[in-house]
Amino acid sequence: IPPHVQKSVNNDMMVTDNNGAVKFPQLCKFCDVRFSTCDNQKSCLSNCSITSICEKPQEVCVAVWRKNDENITLETVCHDPKLPYHDFILEDAASPKCIMKEKKKPGETFFMCSCSSDECNDNIIFSEEYNTSNPD
């Protein structure tokens, strides 16, 4: 990093790779929680028109699909994979695709996915064929 660009102590806005190059942040769909019509489909589009620059370069894209007796919602955000989200670890943060995995939540059906390519939480995938381990 050139000397005129200050590197702040304990600053997570400036994330560098092993070569000292600064990482670009992720671009993610970011509509927070919205009502959704996505149900019983192999995959869905988020219908979120807002693509945001994630605040910190280490953040990834996240989508959370929830269904209860009253409604279905889809949440799209950026989040740091080192921190839990809705009390769950983002296990699949390095994936280029947002492959939904069911999580146990009382009183509702709860699926969550995370991914690390631009706007990858725009297309959320429920299909079982993606959830099996890929030998490649």
């Epitope: 070569n19 600064v22 990482k23 670009f24 370069p57 280029p96 631009d118």
Partner: nanobody, 124 residues
Framework: EVQLLESGGGLVQPGGSLRLSCAAS???????RMWWVRQAPGKGLEWVS?????????YYANSVKGRFTISRDNSKNTLYLQMNSLRAEDTAVYYC?????????????????WGQGTLVTVSS
């Protein structure tokens, strides 16, 4: 190689406007996603805005949405940032950066050149 030179900064009162420019030398400007990045005194980098090379789709940080507008003129190899309704917290050195193309956009900043940036001070 694309080299970058920022200009247009200065002192402006809160609520005022400024337009920053980033002049790129080199013939490959049209291949790059371009960014504006800022660094406030004693703080880290904040990624402000980005624009695609083709179609010119734009992206903004939540902190500047609705106030800043990024644009580019590929025929002039120039990137712009129109900043309106400026606030004290917008005070920073503003840099432009290029993001290399690829199958998916490279996530590391190719630091082959940094300009000195341009200082924006918002104060009454």
């Amino acid at each position: 190689e694309v080299q970058l030179l920022e200009s247009g900064g200065g002192l402006v009162q809160p609520g005022g406007s400024l337009r920053l420019s980033c002049a790129a030398s080199g013939s490959t400007f049209t291949e790059y996603r371009m960014w504006w990045v800022r660094q406030a005194p004693g703080k880290g980098l904040e990624w402000v805005s980005a624009i695609e090379p083709i179609g010119h789709r734009t992206y903004y940080a939540n902190s500047v949405k609705g106030r800043f507008t990024i644009s580019r003129d590929n025929s002039k190899n120039t990137l712009y940032l129109q900043m309106n309704s400026l606030r004290a917290e917008d005070t920073a050195v503003y840099y432009c950066a290029k993001q290399a193309p690829g199958e998916k956009w490279a996530r590391r900043w190719d630091l082959d050149y940094w300009g000195q940036g341009t200082l924006v001070t918002v104060s009454s």
